[in-house]
């Protein structure tokens, strides 16, 4: 457990930019939590560099990260989940840079899954449903979800809808008829815990019905 690098130490190492970012995932593997860190500069020579977390841990002073190609990773039950930990980039016993981080403020949820869209002919709408592993978790249970959809031909014209449930209704009249749509969803912590958006779920593709000329309504596919 060593402090910050002193001036004059580490010679050339001090000239490099060792800034890094981290995210935590709670109960990602049963009751195990994970912490993932990576350098912001992809060109940093990571050969002799290690990451260490100290403080706000259960019955240990510090834990060392495992290196997995370009990222550094810990999986453990030993996070207190309160207060700030000291996360340091180290070469040997010397700390090159350190950050104090509260792991409850850098939570990245797991991506939602099982996204599907069902057309309801009688209601003239589409019911979007998806699942999240967080419904079963003890900690990060309350999430805000961001459902994004677009007409497949409109590459960057995404429409976003924020919701706290895992079900959304899209009105048929708000969508173009006889069009192919792509839809996806991601999540972010929304109560007590803070952090980042999850990865996007796999996209789901669906086609809107044609308009029925006599009634002005869309035909089911």
């Amino acid at each position: 457990e060593s402090g910050y690098a002193q001036n004059g130490d580490l010679e050339d190492a001090e000239l490099d930019d060792y800034s890094f970012s981290c995210y935590s995932q709670l109960e990602v593997n049963g009751s195990q939590h994970s912490l993932t860190c990576a350098f912001e500069d992809p060109d940093v020579n990571i050969t002799n560099l290690e990451f260490e977390i100290c403080g706000a841990l259960v019955e240990v002073k510090c834990l060392n990260f495992r290196k997995l190609q370009e990222i550094y990773f810990i999986e453990t039950k030993k996070f207190l989940l309160i207060g700030k930990s000291n996360i340091c980039v180290k070469v040997g016993e010397k700390s090159l840079t350190c950050k104090k981080i509260d792991l409850t403020t850098i939570v990245k949820p797991e991506a939602p899954f099982d996204l599907s869209v069902v057309y309801r002919e009688g209601a003239n709408d589409f019911v979007v449903t998806f699942n999240t592993s967080h419904l079963q978790k003890k900690y990060v249970k309350v999430l805000m979800h961001d459902v994004a959809y677009r007409q497949e031909k409109d590459e960057n014209k995404w429409t976003h809808v924020n919701l706290s449930s895992t079900k959304l209704t899209l009105l048929q009249r708000k969508l173009q008829p006889a069009a192919m749509y792509e839809i996806k969803v991601r999540s972010i912590p929304d109560h007590y815990f803070k952090g980042f958006w999850s990865e996007w779920s796999p996209s789901y593709y669906f086609r809107t019905p044609e308009i029925n000329n006599s009634s002005g309504e869309m035909d089911p596919i």
Epitope: E1, C54, G55, L81, G83, N86
Partner: antibody, heavy 119, light 105 residues
Framework: EVQLQQSGPELLKPGASMKISCKAS????????MNWVKQSHGKNLEWIGL????????SYNQKFKGKATLTVAKSSSTAYMELLSLTSEDSAVYYC????????????WGAGTTVTVSS | EIVLTQSPAITAASLGQKVTITCSAS?????MHWYQQKSGTSPKPWIY???KLASGVPVRFSGSGSGTSYSLTISSMEAEDAAIYYC????????FGGGTKLEIK
């Protein structure tokens, strides 16, 4: 005003067990760890353990594992320390102390509970 | 487990005198805290994270150090400073030093 109010002094026989309470007021109880510290002979301070009131996660000094058990009642903002199988070595003043999670020092202390173990 | 050794164990200082109390760690410590305790009362946070003064602590107090050597300094001793001072490491298992008793000469 942030305060930690501890239960009163105790005189106990060897082999007995007892529970000290520490009622917190004036702050968000679940936002800080609650720590327990033993002071023997008016001098030596020893950290016993802590509890995160938000989730009940505990961390103990190895020396006090099996001797002390930490719990909380969130509804009443009260922390408890149970001391088991008391001996004369457990005679001491016991403090609860709020842990500042930014710097990991004990920023607010209770007045202490004197425990005397004697036959 | 880190051992914190405070020196001197007891010291006496005249009013107005500069006082330095040291805390030596058996291995490197990132941050050190200091507490003041007067007879019959609970410890009070005095200096945290090496050099930050706790609320209400007079500016004649200062803290410094790194690695295995830390110190608390009083620039000019006053009567109310007579007390026992404890150092404490910031991390598990939050070990305290044995204390330095500061008296008035």
């Amino acid at each position: 005003e942030v305060q930690l109010q501890q239960s009163g002094p105790e005189l106990l026989k060897p082999g007995a067990s007892m529970k000290i309470s520490c009622k917190a007021s004036g702050y968000s109880f679940t936002g800080y760890t609650m720590n327990w510290v033993k002071q023997s002979h008016g001098k030596n301070l020893e950290w016993i353990g802590l509890i995160n009131p938000y989730n009940g996660v505990t961390s103990y000094n190895q020396k006090f594992k099996g001797k002390a058990t930490l719990t909380v009642a969130k509804s009443s903002s009260t922390a408890y320390m149970e001391l088991l199988s008391l001996t004369s070595e457990d005679s001491a003043v016991y403090y609860c102390a709020r842990g500042d999670g930014n710097y990991w020092y004990f920023d607010v202390w209770g007045a202490g509970t004197t425990v005397t173990v004697s036959s | 487990e880190i051992v914190l050794t405070q020196s001197p164990a007891i010291t006496a200082a005249s009013l107005g005198q500069k006082v330095t109390i040291t805390c030596s760690a058996s291995s490197s410590v990132t941050y050190m805290h200091w507490y003041q305790q007067k007879s019959g009362t609970s410890p009070k946070p005095w200096i945290y994270e090496i050099s930050k003064l706790a609320s209400g602590v007079p500016v004649r107090f200062s803290g410094s150090g790194s690695g295995t050597s830390y110190s608390l300094t009083i620039s000019s001793m006053e009567a109310e400073d007579a007390a026992i001072y404890y150092c404490q490491e910031w991390n598990y298992p939050y070990t305290f030093g044995g204390g330095t008793k500061l008296e008035i000469k």
